[in-house]
């Protein structure tokens, strides 16, 4: 019995659902009563899901798997794995037994995009040309391990004096911290690129240092120029710092975070005490770092509704403020492709191909092309609908007249994460049915 699975690994984003495709060719007169189907982990032989005696025997894998019962009779033995975790990565074997027996293994490659890097300087005040400064580039919650590259403002690679460490959290996601030590010139731009090798996703940030003494007078409040990009459901740090003078004590500090536009209070520190969160109890300061001038705000479990500008007000004897933008993002799922009509297709038929990708933010850009990379822009209709959480489901419909054969591919791009998700469908033969019977 020939069992078919994809040659390439199935790539799935952490938290999304993945389909491990497996198919066989049922003979005429085949009934599900004859079918024994077992999915198991290739290495440990742990049972994942099974179908026997005409019945779905259910998930033996954390209750996160499902078959496609309506498609089994057509030879579709694919397995749906829900809420993918890093620990799911590996090889799954699909065993099919009717009268004969066959098996094949499919690899699952798990991935998670890295956050836009945050950049910190140490020391971060009174910098002069000739000073040695440590620049730290931190990017969070990615998988697998990242590759990190540094360069200056002219694209010159900076490879000396770089130390990169990557630590996995309980979920197996990596936080990467890369440290560059440089001697300052008159001024300079330093940029850090964090690459996810599986998603081929680049996240980058840069810092420009102009060494000079801060002007006396108002408190100089520093925030990142670029928006802070945070994935929905993760935590974000809105960085804000000031330069405390010698003899500064927290009793002198008044710190207020508020929404820039509505002036709604978010969090405050006054009279030597953290006054707590006024923002859905999802914010926190870094109390141990306040005395060193770190007034950053931690925003937990980021939602789409959090997107916008936050102002950091610092008052000691003098007063200063600066606004930092929060850009919320969520990766789009791998598009699913459907055809209408989906059977007895012949050259000359008009067919509607729908490309659907789910739960991304902000709105996606959608591109269609044929198998030669030629863009298909005519007869495309794209709609994007936000759910209650503000995440978008995108549905793009392409109407084409079939040739003898053709590949149609759809690319869904998240413009903030610079993340591309794509799906394609190949229509061959005459006549044919979709999905093709294996």
């Amino acid at each position: 019995l020939e069992v078919q699975v994809p040659e390439d690994p199935v790539v799935a984003l952490v938290g999304t659902d993945a389909t491990l495709c497996c198919s066989f060719s049922p003979e005429p007169g085949f009934s599900l009563a004859q079918l024994n189907l077992i999915w198991q982990l290739t290495d440990t032989k742990q049972l994942v899901h099974s179908f026997a005696e005409g019945q779905d025997q259910g998930s033996a894998y954390a209750n996160r798997t499902a078959l496609f019962p309506d498609l089994l009779a057509q030879g579709n033995a694919s397995l749906r794995l829900q809420r993918v975790r890093v620990a799911d990565e590996g090889s799954f074997t699909c065993f099919v037994s009717i009268r004969d027996f066959g098996s094949a293994a499919v690899s699952l490659q798990v991935a998670a995009p890295y956050s836009k890097p945050s950049m910190t300087l140490e020391p971060n005040k009174d910098l002069r040309p000739g000073d040695t400064v440590t620049i730290t580039c931190s990017s969070y919650q990615g998988y697998p391990e990242a590759e990190v590259f540094w360069q200056d403002g002219q694209g010159v690679p900076l490879t000396g004096n770089v130390t990169t460490s990557q630590m996995a959290n309980e979920q197996g996601l990596f936080d990467v911290h890369s440290i560059l030590r440089v001697v300052l010139g008159a001024n300079g731009t330093y940029s850090c690129l964090v690459r996810n090798p599986v998603l081929q996703q680049d996240a980058h940030s840069s810092v420009t240092i102009t060494p000079q003494r801060s002007p006396t007078g108002a408190v100089e409040v520093q925030v990142p120029e670029d928006p802070v990009v945070a994935l929905v459901g993760t935590d974000a740090t809105l960085r804000c710092s000031f330069s405390p003078e010698p003899g500064f004590s927290l009793a002198q500090l008044n710190l207020i975070w508020q929404l820039t536009d509505t002036k709604q209070l978010v969090h405050s520190f006054t009279e030597g005490r953290d006054q707590g969160s006024a923002y859905a109890n999802r914010t926190a300061l870094f109390p141990d770092l306040l005395a060193q001038g770190n007034a950053s705000l931690r925003l937990q479990r980021v939602r789409v509704a959090d997107e916008g500008s936050f102002t950091c007000f610092v008052s000691i004897r003098d007063f200063g403020s600066a606004a930092v933008s929060l850009q919320v993002a969520a990766p789009y799922s791998k598009p699913s492709m459907t055809l209408e009509p989906n059977k007895d297709l012949r050259p000359g038929d008009t067919v509607t191909i729908t490309c659907s990708s789910y739960r991304g933010y902000p709105e996606a850009e959608v591109f269609w092309q044929d198998g030669q990379g030629v863009p298909l822009t005519g007869n495309v209709t794209t709609s994007q609908m936000a759910n209650e959480q503000g995440l978008f489901d995108v549905h793009s419909v392409l109407r084409v007249v079939l040739g003898a054969n053709g590949t149609y591919s759809c690319l869904v791009r998240n413009p903030v994460l610079q993340q591309d998700a794509h799906g394609s469908v190949t229509i061959t033969g005459q006549p044919m049915t979709f999905p093709p019977e294996a």
Epitope: E147, F149, G153, Q154, V156
Partner: antibody, heavy 121, light 106 residues
Framework: EVQLVQSGAEVKKPGSSVKVSCKAS????????IHWVRQAPGQGLEWMGY????????DYNQKFKDRVTITADKSTSTAYMELSSLRSEDTAVYYC??????????????WGQGTTVTVSS | EIVLTQSPDFQSVTPKEKVTITCRAS?????MNWYQQKPDQSPKLLIK???NLASGVPSRFSGSGSGTDFTLTINSLEAEDAATYYC?????????FGQGTKLEIK
């Protein structure tokens, strides 16, 4: 129009030096690094080094480090590459090129027309 | 030094054919650029940052890849594409080019 115009062909004796110029026009000369790349007859491209015309920082391919000097004159928007102790294997076309782009992606978007240097006794 | 190895070194192809040139780096690079050089001409930028078409370059050219393996693809080759193609990286010193792939049109 952004252009890099190089000096004319040179014929040199082994052991001597050659200095090739590259005049930039149509853009801010100090905003981009200028690189020198050479190509021996029938061979591929070989990077020699670069200069940041603003800071005058330079870096060279170790292979040429002791023999090459790259300089720039901001007042005339001209970069120079001098190669000393010439030998026959230095016979090549020498190109200057502008390294352009923005963080973090950079590339050679403008090339000079090339200067042929022939080393022969 | 990061060594870039292109394959093939030489290819003779007929018009309308699809051509794939690969560039393998000896260690991981952040991105790859591709250049086209015709006889007695200066190199010309073709693909920047792995997959972005340079200005004025026909859409039959495309680039892809990541890490150590990169590809330049020419869909439906035309006679004017006869040239030598070079990949280039500068993720670490020195800046390096591939040895080149010469395309000849039959």
């Amino acid at each position: 129009e952004v252009q890099l115009v190089q000096s004319g062909a040179e014929v040199k004796k082994p052991g001597s030096s050659v200095k090739v110029s590259c005049k930039a026009s149509g853009y801010s000369f100090t905003s981009y690094t200028i690189h020198w790349v050479r190509q021996a007859p029938g061979q591929g491209l070989e990077w020699m080094g670069y200069i940041n015309p603003n800071s005058r920082n330079t870096d060279y391919n170790q292979k040429f480090k002791d023999r090459v000097t790259i300089t720039a004159d901001k007042s005339t928007s001209t970069a120079y590459m001098e190669l000393s102790s010439l030998r026959s294997e230095d016979t090549a076309v020498y190109y200057c090129a502008r390294y352009s782009g923005s963080t973090p992606y950079w590339y050679f978007d403008v090339w000079g027309q090339g200067t042929t240097v022939t080393v022969s006794s | 030094e990061i060594v870039l190895t292109q394959s093939p070194d030489f290819q003779s192809v007929t018009p309308k054919e699809k051509v794939t040139i690969t560039c393998r780096a000896s260690s991981s690079v952040s991105y790859m650029n591709w250049y086209q050089q015709k006889p007695d001409q200066s190199p010309k930028l073709l693909i920047k940052a792995t997959s972005n078409l340079a200005s004025g370059v026909p859409s039959r050219f495309s680039g892809s890849g990541s890490g150590t393996d990169f590809t330049l693809t020419i869909n439906s080759l035309e006679a004017e594409d006869a040239a030598t193609y070079y990949c280039q990286q500068w993720s670490s010193n020195p800046l390096t080019f591939g040895q080149g792939t010469k395309l000849e049109i039959k």
